[in-house]
Interface confidence: medium
């Protein structure tokens, strides 16, 4: 009783990104405790006066929760005992971006870690052959991006080639007036080649590949969040 010492525990977060309008996860883990009632989780956001979320004595304690997070947060209550303090954030908003602190108290001590959370919009592109065009044309479409991304075309056969002169990219604002639809058209494509449409902003990088041969068309898409690091 009244033992002296540093009493710090290890808390680990992972920088992540939230997709506007979808649910997001702010990841945080800590050294677990054997007793749930001795664990307190507090999520805080820099510049926000109230708490983002508080979990203590085995349940949510939301009396000090800030208005901007009201009804939008939850921890994985059944996983707290094993050291998971990750926060689920409903309906991610652009304004949710910022520095968060995952603050943990257990009977072993306390600790915290900061987490940089970026918000934006990102989606998988789809590349199709545009049969309506007069020449062989590819059309790359991605429904939701923000901030405005860059679009670059590449090909397997002509590696290192610059396709900016033979492509045209447009951005169309979506109905909620934040995200935009990305459409990029590549002209003068050749058969028996694989083309890649690469869309990138500071949050995510997505690639849509299409392989066109005389007998078939093969497609593949990939999305990578750029700021996810331990």
């Amino acid at each position: 009783f009244g033992i002296s010492g540093r009493h710090s525990i290890t808390v680990t977060t992972v920088a992540s990104a939230g997709n506007i309008g979808e649910d997001g996860i702010l990841s945080c883990t800590f050294e677990p405790d054997i007793k749930l009632s001795d664990i307190v989780i507090q999520w805080l956001k820099e510049g926000v006066l109230g708490l983002v979320h508080e979990f203590k004595e085995g349940k949510d304690e939301l009396s000090e929760q800030d208005e901007m997070f009201r009804g939008r947060t939850a921890v994985f209550a059944d996983q707290v005992i094993v050291g998971n303090a990750s926060l689920r954030l409903k309906n991610v908003q652009l304004t949710d971006a910022g520095t968060y602190k995952c603050y943990i108290i257990t009977s072993k001590g306390k600790g915290n870690a900061n987490l940089e959370y970026k918000t934006g919009a990102f989606s998988m592109p789809e590349v199709n052959v545009d049969y309506n065009a007069s020449s062989e044309t590819l059309r790359c479409e991605a429904p939701r991006w923000f901030p405005q991304p860059t679009v670059v075309w590449a090909s397997q056969v002509d590696q290192g080639a610059n396709f900016s002169e033979v492509s045209n990219t447009s951005f169309e604002l979506n109905s909620e007036n934040v995200t935009m639809k990305v459409v990029s058209v590549l002209y003068n494509v050749t058969i028996n080649n694989t083309y890649s449409c690469m869309i990138e902003n500071d949050i995510a990088k997505a690639t849509g590949d299409i392989k066109v041969t005389e007998s078939e068309i093969k497609r593949r898409s990939h999305l990578q969040l750029l700021n996810s690091k331990a």
Partner: antibody
Framework: EVQLVESGGGLVQPGGSLRLSCAVS????????WNWVRQAPGKGLEWIGE???????TYNPSLKSRFTISVDTAKNSFYLQMNSLRAEDTAVYYC???????????WGQGTLVTVSS | DIQMTQSPSSLSASVGDRVTITCRAS??????LGWYQQKPGKAPKRLIY???SLQSGVPSRFSGSGSGTEFTLTISSLQPEDFATYYC?????????FGGGTKVEIK
Amino acid sequence: EVQLVESGGGLVQPGGSLRLSCAVSGGSFSGYYWNWVRQAPGKGLEWIGEINHSGSATYNPSLKSRFTISVDTAKNSFYLQMNSLRAEDTAVYYCARELYNWNVDHWGQGTLVTVSS
Amino acid sequence: DIQMTQSPSSLSASVGDRVTITCRASQGIRNDLGWYQQKPGKAPKRLIYAASSLQSGVPSRFSGSGSGTEFTLTISSLQPEDFATYYCLQHNSYPRTFGGGTKVEIK
């Protein structure tokens, strides 16, 4: 609104002991760290130590051997036991809730301890 | 221990002046720093938390900046009620340490 009220201060002779109390009302006691901070007359603030509701305490190494912090959750109170007091321990002693957390900042009004013969 | 060096230790200023107080940490403390105002006979009152966030109810003329080892408290236009002593506090590691204080006096 959380309130912290210190008591137990007063005049004590060098070498003597004193126990300060801090009663917490109007808020949860568990899940926070409870701190003692002191301020000698005309001087700056010095952190003494902290304790949580389960009795786990951390001290300022310069004071650890003579000062002990304890807690009584049934009474929503925590305490500072001071032994082998010296003239330089004369100060206003404040209790405070969780200096560590960004969002919580509650202090008691302070209690004066005078060590003099 | 992390040493918090606060400067100046005192300053004289007039109402309406812009006042800047600096705290330097002996090692990096991220943004784990608060600024406190203390008036004679009273407990400290927190003005700024997390180095730059304004405490609820504190006038916007107070602002904080900095990260790592260098931190600043600025009062954009000094008011009569601002004459007090100001302290920084690091809560990055144990033991918690305060700066030595800056007494702001009327010129």
